[in-house]
Interface confidence: low
Amino acid sequence: LEASEEVELEPCLAPSLEQQEQELTVALGQPVRLCCGRAERGGHWYKEGSRLAPAGRVRGWRGRLEIASFLPEDAGRYLCLARGSMIVLQNLTLITGDSLTSSNDDEDPKSHRDPSNRHSYPQQAPYWTHPQRMEKKLHAVPAGNTVKFRCPAAGNPTPTIRWLKDGQAFHGENRIGGIRLRHQHWSLVMESVVPSDRGTYTCLVENAVGSIRYNYLLDVLERSPHRPILQAGLPANTTAVVGSDVELLCKVYSDAQPHIQWLKHIVINGSSFGADGFPYVQVLKTADINSSEVEVLYLRNVSAEDAGEYTCLAGNSIGLSYQSAWLTVLPEEDPTWTAAAPEARYTD
């Protein structure tokens, strides 16, 4: 639907389901007035998830969407939701008329054109419908991971997509495990990537009017075994009041199967360390990474005896990592008192 003076949907009633998804082409500079719901009880208008204010150049007011003069940045997805509910009364996309023949990625509208839409529109060269989802150009992934490249596009007639690897047609026939092409999702999926999958992957989207392409770079990292990596700052020094519950958190990354222990440092015969140089510890919790919530240590109804140093210890076949934090327990009757706990220790 190309407007000459003003775009308007009348009457202001909830549309039938057939009307619920629409695409409207609006010429630059033209005013827009769209309605949904009944005048006094009209729905709220949203653009790209943000509710429109009742005043301003683009406004949602008494069930009406009003744009004084249509600009390129006004293109996008608009929703009208019924008052007091999340029922969608209108779901439409406004497209800039002046960019109909453009294939410049930067000027393409952000929204996805539904090919099943019943409204007629002129021929249009392919364009990216979600360029923001294509911003990650370099994909560096560990060997064995799954990689998915997407080039969501639209146009009229509906364009086709094909893929190139390092400039050559790519169908994955020489790749162990093959590839999955999901044309309706404009995607290429490769499972269990290996170093030979490294390269430049190009999506080529074309129709009778024009074509566009985009390059993704894939680097496959050979995973080197290493000792577990613990997220810095965890577990964190914590202060709690007697009787309260405490959670200490430890985030572990390990390529090799890790085992995790939560330890509390204790004193035996007035000493914190044994003859072997190791601290005396009490094992509070031990498991592997697959165990439920092993990365969290729960301390219920803490007392003064629970105060002290706690260590999250993670080990695998390569080595060992551990980080410690201090729990300070304050007396219930004096919550203003604080003690300076020693810094958390980060040890090799």
Partner: antibody, heavy 121, light 110 residues
Framework: EVQLLESGGGLVQPGGSLRLSCAAS????????MNWVRQAPGKGLEWVAV????????YYADSVKGRFTISRDNSKNTLYLQMNSLRAEDTAVYYC??????????????WGQGTLVTVSS | QSVLTQPPSASGTPGQRVTISCSGS????????VNWYQQLPGTAPKLLIY???QRPSGVPDRFSGSKSGTSASLAISGLRSEDEADYYC???????????FGGGTKLTVL
């Protein structure tokens, strides 16, 4: 008690092949990286290869890359070393080794008794 | 040539203190902890020191280890005749993605 028992060593001609096995017991084999380490007569220790707990990662010393293949069968608790294109300099005692940690109190570092591979014409 | 450098030999008289050095680089000793092995003639290596300076149970306190930067050392005090053996340092090398060893030091008790 942890036990690693190597087998499959023997005399082989240059260019020939041999497959070593290592039967493991006394620990969770499937949770540990496994290694082969060799020692030529009168020489020092040389690491040969390592395989991850699930077999997905394998790394080799440059001296054996492309000729030796490390593998494992977790259902049989067995580690293997397939040795092809053998050379005189591959003559050595081959040890099956698992290295890990008894996390906190002590080491987890066990060696088999070794099996002798002799490459000679 | 070994990735880690050790002196080929060392010697001492009973009761003496002997130190064996092990030099590496940032990708091995500089990044990871060091193990020391003792190999008596005709036997498999036995772990002597792990995590730079820790002794497994059963290893006498005459054996001690230390690490500084990209070097490590093994000290044996109160030397005994049964300490006569080959000693190897070892660590993981991040660049080579494997375990590396020193060339070994033959300790002779005079």
């Amino acid at each position: 008690e942890v036990q690693l028992l190597e087998s499959g060593g023997g005399l082989v001609q240059p260019g020939g092949s041999l497959r070593l096995s290592c039967a493991a017991s006394g620990f969770t084999f499937s949770s540990n990286y496994m290694n082969w380490v060799r020692q030529a007569p009168g020489k020092g220790l040389e690491w040969v290869a390592v395989i991850s707990y699930d077999g997905s990662n394998k790394y080799y010393a440059d001296s054996v890359k492309g000729r030796f293949t490390i593998s494992r069968d977790n259902s049989k608790n067995t580690l293997y070393l397939q040795m092809n294109s053998l050379r005189a300099e591959d003559t050595a005692v081959y040890y099956c080794v698992t290295k890990s940690r008894d996390f906190w109190r002590g080491p987890f570092d066990y060696w088999g008794q070794g099996t002798l591979v002799t490459v000679s014409s | 040539q070994s990735v880690l450098t050790q002196p080929p030999s060392a010697s001492g008289t009973p009761g003496q203190r002997v130190t064996i050095s092990c030099s590496g680089s940032s990708s091995n000793i500089g990044s990871n902890t060091v193990n020391w092995y003792q190999q008596l003639p005709g036997t498999a290596p036995k772990l002597l020191i792990y995590r730079n300076n820790q002794r497994p149970s059963g290893v006498p306190d005459r054996f001690s280890g230390s690490k500084s930067g990209t070097s490590a050392s093994l000290a044996i005090s109160g030397l005994r005749s049964e300490d006569e053996a080959d000693y190897y340092c070892s660590t993981w090398d991040d660049s080579l993605r494997g375990w590396v060893f020193g060339g070994g030091t033959k300790l002779t008790v005079l």
